[in-house]
């Protein structure tokens, strides 16, 4: 069975084809090759002789037991080598020779028992080494690590490391890898020698499900003393053994670390006193809780010095009381409990993401809701009912505003966005908005992107609501049940590049409304009911137009519409997916491609 | 289409068939078997995925006695610092995991429940597997 040609001459997918040897009928130009799940078993010298251009090679689950010297020799362009799930028993010292550009080596679940004997010391370009799910017992980083000066990610998770000693990290003292991210999750740790991490600098350290008791966790965290880490991730996994007890003593040792960003990811435990618990983390710049349950929501009004707070997938009794002077970014997404938004006091806030919480807002939006006048980014998407009762008073700095898939009320009663002259991006898609007021977008003089798919218009008619949006470059009006539009609806949009009118109820096509769109490049009219043209004579679309989508419409392939069908043929170079432009009527021509039709109509004399 | 039996409990019988053409082997055990009136137990899965499990989600299509419920999307793995350790599993890596579950107080009417589970993962998104579970429910009391 042949391999699947994904990208001709470049990418080949040969997964699970029962190959016992490397295929010899693929082009020399192959760059990406997936040979996973084939019983190759043995890689001899110059196994990839015929693949001089190879950049990505996937050998997952190939039952490889032996890799000989020079197996990858001559793959000087290879950047990614994946060996996941091979029961390697014999790995020659020169197994990885010739890989002078290798950046990513994945040797997950390969029976690797030690880093010491892993022959990768010459791979100077290596950025990512993943040796998770192996049998490694010692965390001693071998001397050859001093050659791996580009290493950024080392994944040692799911191994058998129990202890970390001062001597294990000696090589990092000799050559501080300022950018190294280290994942030690799911190792059964019970001892970290104090001083082992002293004066070590890491970009990220992840320790999840490492400790089987609170005491072990406490002493191991104390053993991290002296570590300087940009991002520390602690926590557990839902499907692994969890701590039975967790209290403030667990994290006391963090006072002896220098931490820029902290994240606690999943804890099967109710956090009741976060002030005491995170006492050592009051001055980290970014603080993040993922999948934890928080009892006392008032604690977030304590004087923490955080600049970024992230609460994701957490459970709350009610919406938390947030009063944080220094906070610039708040991400509060996919949380449960506390369905009603209550005012927060965050005077420095510039970025606020409150998406996917099922929240309802009795009144939106003004500076009093968020306690800030500095807000530039506001995401309230995928929430409940949001009643628009204020026109963003004090929030004039806003540049990005997203309401998609929330239920907006009172949107057509006044110019809601009147004061948002700095707004660049607005998404009100699928918000149950019914446009009945022409001034709905007044004030948005800087707006570049407007997404309003899935809403509706009075009498299914698009009026002149865009007159002030002179900088608009992207407009999505899809799924709005539109049947007609004002001939001057788009007259002021001279910068518009993309217009999506798909999935509406237009029965005819007219070029007149687009005559002023001098920058228009993409026009999508797919999934309408277009049968013919509005006027007998269709003009040309703007000369800037490059893509016109008329697929999945109801073309009437009859003589009375001959001029329209001819006009469509004349637009051939603009049309996309022409094979999906089919006749709907008459019945004998149903399903026939419009462009292949040859309609010869006799003129009645 | 071969049917794979999972388990029987006092009020339910659970089995599944594959609804994709690949039919990559997957081993599913429930201990103790689910009782629909209330249940607490462990779900054990042994599986070797054909793609990374990063950003795994399930599309669930549930039918109750021939009545189709709306499609549900259940996100399991968001993509970073996920709740489940198997979210970091790579293509070809053994997934051997036990997940605890519990529910109570749901009243199910007697009949045949079908649940098509489409597992989607990776970037670009592709189907990982598709299983159709059939639960025959005979409540002792309702």
């Amino acid at each position: 069975e042949p391999c699947v040609e994904v990208v001709p001459n470049i990418t080949y997918q040969c997964m699970e084809l029962n190959f016992y040897k490397i295929p010899d009928n693929l082009p020399f130009s192959t760059k990406n090759l997936d040979l996973s799940f084939n019983p190759l078993r043995h890689l001899g010298s110059y196994s990839f002789f015929s693949f001089p251009e190879l950049q990505v090679l996937d050998l997952s689950r190939c039952e490889i037991q032996t890799i000989e010297d020079g197996a990858y020799q001559s793959l000087s362009h290879l950047s990614t080598l994946i060996l996941t799930g091979n029961p390697i028993q014999s790995l020659a010292l020169g197994a990885f020779s010739g890989l002078s550009s290798l950046q990513k080596l994945v040797a997950v679940e390969t029976n690797l028992a030690s880093l010491e004997n892993f022959p990768i010391g010459h791979l100077k370009t290596l950025k990512e080494l993943n040796v998770a799910h192996n049998l490694i017992q010692s965390f001693k980083l071998p001397e050859y690590f001093s050659n791996l000066t580009n290493l950024e990610h080392l994944d040692l998770s799911s191994n058998k490391i129990q202890s970390i000693y001062c001597t294990d990290l000696r090589v990092l003292h000799q050559m501080p890898l300022l950018n190294l991210s280290l994942d030690l999750s799911l190792n059964p740790m019970n001892f970290i020698q104090p001083g082992a991490f002293k004066e070590i600098r890491l970009h990220k350290l992840t320790l999840r499900n490492n400790f089987d008791s609170l005491n072990v966790m406490k002493t191991c965290i104390q053993g991290l003393a002296g570590l300087e880490v940009h991002r520390l991730v602690l926590g557990e996994f839902r499907n692994e053994g969890n701590l039975e007890k967790f209290d403030k003593s667990a994290l006391e040792g963090l006072c002896n670390l220098t931490i820029e960003e902290f994240r606690l990811a999943y804890l099967d435990y109710y956090l009741d006193d976060i002030i005491d618990l995170f006492n050592c983390l009051t001055n980290v710049s970014s603080f993040s809780l993922v999948s934890v349950t928080i009892e006392r929501v008032k604690d977030f009004s304590y004087n923490f010095g955080w600049q970024h707070l992230e609460l994701v997938n957490c459970k709350f009794g009610q919406f938390p009381t947030l009063k944080l002077k220094s906070l610039k970014r708040l991400t509060f997404t996919s949380n449960k409990g506390g369905n009603a938004f209550s005012e927060v006091d965050l005077p420095s806030l510039e970025f606020l993401d409150l998406s996917r919480n099922g929240l309802s807002f009795k009144g939106c939006c003004s500076q009093s809701d968020f306690g800030t006048t500095s807000l530039k980014y506001l995401d309230l998407s995928f929430n409940g009912v949001i009643t628009m009762s204020s026109n963003f008073l004090g929030l004039e700095q806003l540049e990005h505003l997203d309401f998609q898939h929330s239920n907006l009320k009172q949107m057509s009663e006044f110019s809601v966005f009147l004061s948002l002259r700095n707004l660049i991006y607005l998404d009100i898609s699928h918000t149950h908005t019914r446009v009945a007021f022409n001034g709905i977008f007044n004030g948005l003089s800087s707006l570049e992107v407007l997404k309003m798919a899935g809403n509706s218009f009075q009498e299914n008619f698009l009026p002149d609501i865009f007159t002030e949006l002179r900088n608009l470059t992207f407009l999505d009006l899809s799924q709005c049940q539109l049947e007609q539009l004002s001939p001057t609806a788009f007259n002021s949009l001279s910068s518009l590049q993309v217009l999506n009118m798909s999935h509406n109820n237009f029965f005819s096509l007219d070029t007149f409304p687009y005559k002023c769109l001098n920058s228009l490049q993409v026009l999508d009219y797919s999934l309408n009911h277009i049968m013919t043209s509005k006027k007998q004579e269709l003009q040309h679309f703007p000369s800037s137009l490059a893509f016109l989508n008329l697929t999945q419409n109801d073309f009437a392939c009859t003589c009375e519409h001959q001029s329209f069908l001819q006009w469509i043929k004349d637009q051939r170079q603009l049309l996309v997916e022409v094979e999906r432009m089919e006749c709907a009527t008459p019945s004998d021509k149903q399903g026939m491609p419009v462009l292949s039709l040859n309609i010869t109509c006799q003129m009645n004399k | 289409q071969k049917q794979y039996w999972v388990c029987n409990s006092s009020d339910a019988s659970i089995s599944y068939t594959y609804c994709d053409k690949m039919q990559y082997p997957i081993s599913i055990n429930v201990n103790p078997c689910i009782e629909l009136k209330r249940s607490k137990g462990l779900l054990h899965i042994f599986y070797i995925p054909r793609r990374d499990l990063k950003q795994l989600y399930f599309n669930l299509y549930i039918t109750v006695n021939t009545m189709n419920l709306p499609k549900r999307k259940e996100v399991i793995c968001r993509g970073s610092d996920d709740d489940y350790s198997f979210c970091r599993a790579l293509k070809g890596e053994t997934v051997n995991t036990t997940i605890s579950f519990s529910f109570k107080g749901i009243k199910f009417s007697k009949g045949k429940y079908k649940c098509v589970v489409e597992a989607i993962s990776g970037s670009p998104e592709e189907m990982l597997f598709c299983l159709e579970f059939v639960i025959l429910h005979q409540p002792n009391s309702n």
């Epitope: 040897k21 490397i22 010899d24 020399f28 001899g44 010298s45 110059y46 002789f49 015929s50 | -």
Partner: nanobody
């Protein structure tokens, strides 16, 4: 078993030309691809050019594109490498190699090419 014998190496001035030959003998029917590799002192062996017997498709390393030409003479079971516009950085031992249907790779003993004024 396949035997390969190279010839044609030598000393040449920058800008000059050389033609290397590689004669194959033994189980030549099993050969899929043949090619030329080179190894400069202290460097890894690298691809120069490849040719596929079945369809005649050809590959050249970027460093030799437009200057070197690989060809074959089926009747004589010989592969040639015509090297024009030679540069000092082309100095290396040039090896002929053949890959069989069983994925085994056979090598010649190598021929020295020196480009120097």
């Amino acid at each position: 078993e396949v035997q390969l014998v190279e010839s044609g190496g030598g000393l040449v001035q920058p800008g000059g030309s050389l033609r290397l030959s590689c004669a194959a003998s033994g189980s030549i029917f099993s050969i899929n691809d043949m090619g030329w590799f080179r190894q400069a002192p202290g460097k890894e062996r690298e691809h120069v050019a490849l040719i596929r017997f079945k369809d005649g498709s050809i590959y050249y390393a970027d460093s030799v594109k437009g200057r070197f030409t690989i060809s074959r003479d089926n009747a004589k079971s010989t592969v040639y490498l015509q090297m024009n516009s030679l540069k000092p950085e082309d100095t290396a031992v040039y090896y002929c190699a053949a890959k069989t249907g069983t994925s085994f790779v056979y090598w010649g003993q190598g021929t020295q090419v020196t480009v120097s004024s």
